[in-house]
């Protein structure tokens, strides 16, 4: 997260980290006791999922292995359209005050809505500095028309843009798959942005979760 600050303790109990061994790979969100939602470009063969602590490496955190993941069938490595994936935990997460399910959206929030993006990704770019504590930054939703003015052909349907004019505030490497939460519901998953991160007037681009609630529910049902 660029130009952010540590999240208020316990304010993001649905936030998870996907680790490769002990190394941060991506962010994600807990949908229920068995399922984590993240970005399709985060796919690996096996995951270790960190839950229940804002601090990576915290011994009190739950760590659960996951071996099965299901990318959206329309995901494209070239355009990053449909950049979402469900990861099935090998064992159930234990819900608590620090481990809660995210609220999936019942509607798409409009441009101008203030939202929070969070993650353990690098706080500097291009040189990397990975924090141990979960970082947050507030950004505003940007209309597809305004975002297309910046990204032109790179922007596809079901991509959601967010940022602050003339500001560096944005997600970065390591935040991928993590949540963009607006008015208490999950509206976006960190998908992509320009590199180096934090270019003023280059919005962050997110998978627009409100367009995929049916796929999320159908996929979890299908692979129960």
């Amino acid at each position: 997260i660029i130009d952010g600050a540590p999240c208020a303790r316990g304010s993001h109990p649905w936030q998870v980290a996907l680790l490769s061994g002990n190394q941060l790979h991506c962010g994600g969100v807990l949908v229920n006791e068995r399922w984590v939602l993240t970005a399709a470009h985060c796919k690996m063969n096996e995951y270790t999922v960190h839950l229940g602590s804002d601090t990576l490496g915290d011994r009190r955190a739950q760590r659960i292995k996951a071996s099965k993941s299901f990318r959206h069938p329309g995901y494209s490595t070239q355009t990053h359209v449909n950049d979402l994936m469900l990861v099935k935990l090998n064992s159930q997460a234990r819900l608590s005050s620090m481990v809660k399910k995210v609220r999936l959206p019942s509607r798409c929030e409009p441009p101008g809505t203030t939202c929070t993006v969070s993650g353990w990704g690098t706080t500097t770019s291009p040189d990397v500095t990975f924090p141990s504590d979960l970082m947050c930054v507030d950004v505003k939703l940007i209309s597809p028309q305004d975002c297309t003015k910046v990204y032109k052909d790179l922007l596809e349907n079901s991509m959601l843009c967010a940022g602050i004019p003339d500001s560096k505030k944005n997600a970065c490497n390591g935040d991928s798959g993590g949540p963009l939460v607006c008015r208490g519901t999950l509206q976006g998953l960190v998908s992509w942005g320009t590199f180096p991160c934090g270019q003023p007037n280059d919005p962050g681009v997110y998978t627009q979760v409100c367009k995929f609630t049916k796929w999320i529910n159908d996929t979890m049902k299908k692979h129960r």
Epitope: T77, K152, L154, P200
Partner: antibody, heavy 122, light 107 residues
Framework: QVQLQESGPGLVKPSQTLSLTCTVS??????????WHWIRQHPGKGLEWIGY???????YYNPSLKSRVTISVDTSKNQFSLKLSSVTAADTAVYYC??????????????WGQGTLVTVSS | DIQMTQSPSSLSASVGDRVTITCQAS??????LNWYQQKPGKAPKLLIY???NLETGVPSRFSGSGSGTDFTFTISSLQPEDIATYYC?????????FGGGTKVEIK
């Protein structure tokens, strides 16, 4: 189809400044997510990255050349330029301009100019 | 800077042969590794991006694999038009750096 075309003198005297321009057609230099690079190749050798410029004017140069390099952009002309000062014979090379799709998830050079040979000699 | 070590520096193979080139990064670059083909007097051309993704319009006999520090580029069945020099390039970190190249010739 994006096309890039380098232009500038093919012969530069030692200690002078090498100046090249890259003209972009078929795409806007102001498009977000695309960075505009200079890369060179010494005769019979490999590729050396020089630096880039973004639509905002943000630049990044190879530390090995940083003290001598300036890259600038003219969005109104859809052009970007390279200046390399205090040249020596070691700067004799084919100079390429290139576009990179440069995202957090994916970054690569997708379009290149055909290259222009610059010889440094008195 | 991240050093990219490419091997072999040159190879000679027959038409139809399987050709493999390796590239090793001096530190972890995840999958930010691209492969380019350069024919004499021409600019490099992108073949593979992000370690394993085939660029649009590139024949399927070209493939790439690997992650972290070790990467492989393969031509499954060498064709006469594949005579060229091949370069790997890391895009994980600035400055971007290239391997030394592998010159592929026909026996």
């Amino acid at each position: 189809q994006v096309q890039l075309q380098e232009s500038g003198p093919g012969l530069v005297k030692p200690s002078q400044t090498l100046s090249l321009t890259c003209t972009v057609s078929g795409g806007s230099i102001s498009s977000g997510g695309y960075y505009w690079h200079w890369i060179r190749q010494h005769p019979g050798k490999g590729l050396e990255w020089i630096g880039y410029i973004y639509r905002s004017g943000y630049t990044y140069y190879n530390p090995s050349l940083k003290s001598r390099v300036t890259i600038s952009v003219d969005t109104s002309k859809n052009q970007f330029s390279l200046k390399l000062s205090s040249v020596t014979a070691a700067d004799t090379a084919v100079y390429y301009c290139a576009r990179a799709k440069q995202l957090t998830t994916s970054r690569y050079f997708d379009y290149w100019g055909q290259g222009t040979l610059v010889t440094v000699s008195s | 800077d991240i050093q990219m070590t490419q091997s072999p520096s040159s190879l000679s193979a027959s038409v139809g042969d399987r050709v493999t080139i390796t590239c090793q990064a001096s530190q972890d670059i995840a999958n930010y590794l691209n492969w380019y083909q350069q024919k004499p007097g021409k600019a490099p051309k992108l073949l593979i991006y992000d370690a394993s993704n085939l660029e649009t319009g590139v024949p399927s006999r070209f493939s790439g694999s690997g992650s972290g520090t070790d990467f492989t580029f393969t031509i499954s069945s060498l064709q006469p038009e594949d005579i060229a020099t091949y370069y790997c390039q890391q895009a994980s970190d600035l400055p971007f750096t290239f391997g030394g190249g592998t010159k592929v010739e026909i026996k």
